[in-house]
């Protein structure tokens, strides 16, 4: 038995889980997902029994071999999977686990603006990054640009402090998780304090 | 010094394959996203495809996505092209990329390897 | 496919002359546009993204501007070390693509 072995995957990808064994006379391998049994094979009657009817077109074995090929993932298909290899010339069956994530592609994140203030001609807020549907495990980075700046900023808020006269600058969000990136439409200082230039002291959402 | 470099272009006949490397140093490979691009003699840049950092998400250009695998091998530092079916309008030069910063433009471009499929 | 079709294909000017190369994206791409410069029998070098963010040590005599489908690269001051082709890049969507190149000599 080896150690843990993590994969990744996206929606609607592929997955291999990848089997090497040197167990000479195979009697029999089963796959299992989170405890429940998910492919036997018998190596010997070149049998294949795939126990749930709804996996049967997403698992393959690819090149003859016996790593399990897991394809259309879903976001549910994410767990802990399990290869027993059972042999009559073992005293115990050699096992492997590994533990998969499957994350979902990452579409343009959004942009809410937090309280806003703008005193002595500064205009000062905050912007929210988030996903619309709260994917998991998703790192924001913030872009500032501008003639007088190219700066990152790591989190989902981005602390703004922008005062009138100065060159315009632009904030991009964007998001990454481990299998897709996207940015968000870009936001325009000027365009974003307009709103408060009028009253010098006013807050707004 | 960050680097990237090509390897194994050639001569190939239509309908032959070939597989290119690209060995990269000087940063962290296993971190970033990568990209194969091809130059035409004489024409424009045409970007081919990118894959991720554990090798989950691989894009490519629809009208090569059939023809052209993309892999890595992070422990290698390397990133490959498998090109199959190979035509004559597949003559050019091969770069691979890296994106600066992991975001959508590349600042690291390899030497590039010239690959040419004549009879 | 989003098209990026650049003007003119090739020009000619003078030294100290301002140029401009323009770019339309076939489609809305925001500001995800970054410009490249390819000397002649060299590789791709990166010069601006986000449509108008220069690349570190790129000269300042190079800067970019738009957004949506309409953007420009001009070079100030052409200097006798800027001959080369200018290409265009969207990567506002896939597949990322590139212009056709603008080819720029010196009179």
């Known amino acids: 038995s080896g150690p843990v072995k993590e994969l990744v995957g996206s929606v609607g990808g592929a997955v291999t889980f990848p089997l090497k064994s040197k167990v000479k006379q195979v009697d029999s391998i089963v796959w299992t997902f989170n405890t429940t049994p998910l492919v036997t094979i018998q190596p010997e009657g070149g049998t294949i029994i795939v126990t749930q009817n709804r996996n049967r077109e997403r698992v393959d074995f690819p090149d003859g071999g016996y790593s399990l090929k897991l394809s259309k993932l879903k976001k549910n298909d994410s767990g802990i999977y399990y290869v027993g290899i059972y042999s009559s010339s073992l005293q115990q069956p050699s096992t492997q686990e590994y533990v998969l994530h499957v994350y979902e592609h990452l579409s343009k994140p959004k942009v809410t603006m937090g309280l806003q203030s703008n005193k002595n001609g500064t205009c000062v807020t905050n912007l929210t990054c988030c996903m619309e549907h709260g994917e998991e495990d998703v790192i924001y980075t913030w872009k500032a640009l501008g003639q007088a700046a190219n700066e990152s900023h790591n989190g989902s808020i981005l602390p703004i402090s922008w005062r009138w006269g100065e060159s315009d600058m632009t904030f991009i969000c964007v998001a990454r998780n481990p299998v897709s990136r996207n940015f968000s439409s870009p936001i325009l200082a000027r365009k974003l304090c307009e709103g408060a230039a009028d009253d010098p002291d006013s807050s707004m959402v | 010094e960050v680097q990237l470099v090509e390897s194994g272009g050639g001569l190939v006949q239509p309908g032959g394959s070939l597989r290119l490397s690209c060995a990269a140093s000087?940063?962290?490979?296993?971190?970033?996203?990568m990209s194969w691009v091809r130059q035409a003699p004489g024409k424009g840049l045409e970007w081919i495809g990118e894959?991720?950092?554990?090798?989950?998400?691989?894009n490519y250009a629809p009208s090569l996505k059939d023809k052209f695998i993309i892999s890595r091998d992070n422990a290698k530092n390397s990133l490959y092209l498998q090109m199959n079916s190979l035509r004559a309008e597949d003559t050019a030069v091969y770069y691979c990329?890296?994106?600066?910063?992991?975001?959508?433009?590349?600042?690291?471009w390899g030497q590039g390897t010239l690959v040419t499929v004549s009879s | 496919d989003i098209q990026m079709t650049q003007s003119p294909s090739s020009l000619s000017a003078s030294v100290g002359d301002r140029v401009t190369i323009t770019c339309k994206a076939s489609?809305?791409?925001?500001?995800?546009v970054a410009w490249y410069q390819q000397k002649p029998g060299k590789v791709p070098k990166l010069l601006i993204y986000?449509?108008?963010t220069r690349h570190t040590g790129v000269p300042d005599r190079f800067s970019g501007s738009g957004s949506g489908t309409d953007f420009t690269l001009t070079i100030s001051s052409l200097q006798p070390e800027d001959v080369a082709t200018y290409y265009c890049?969207?990567?506002?969507?896939?597949?990322?693509?590139f212009g056709q190149g603008t080819k720029v000599e010196i009179k």
């Open positions: 990329a890296r994106p600066d910063g992991n975001y959508w433009y590349f600042d690291v």
């Open positions: 000087g940063f962290d490979f296993s971190r970033y996203w």
């Open positions: 894959i991720n950092p554990d090798s989950s998400t691989i």
């Open positions: 489609q809305d791409v925001g500001i995800a």
């Open positions: 986000w449509a108008s």
């Open positions: 890049q969207q990567y506002s969507s896939y597949p990322y693509t």
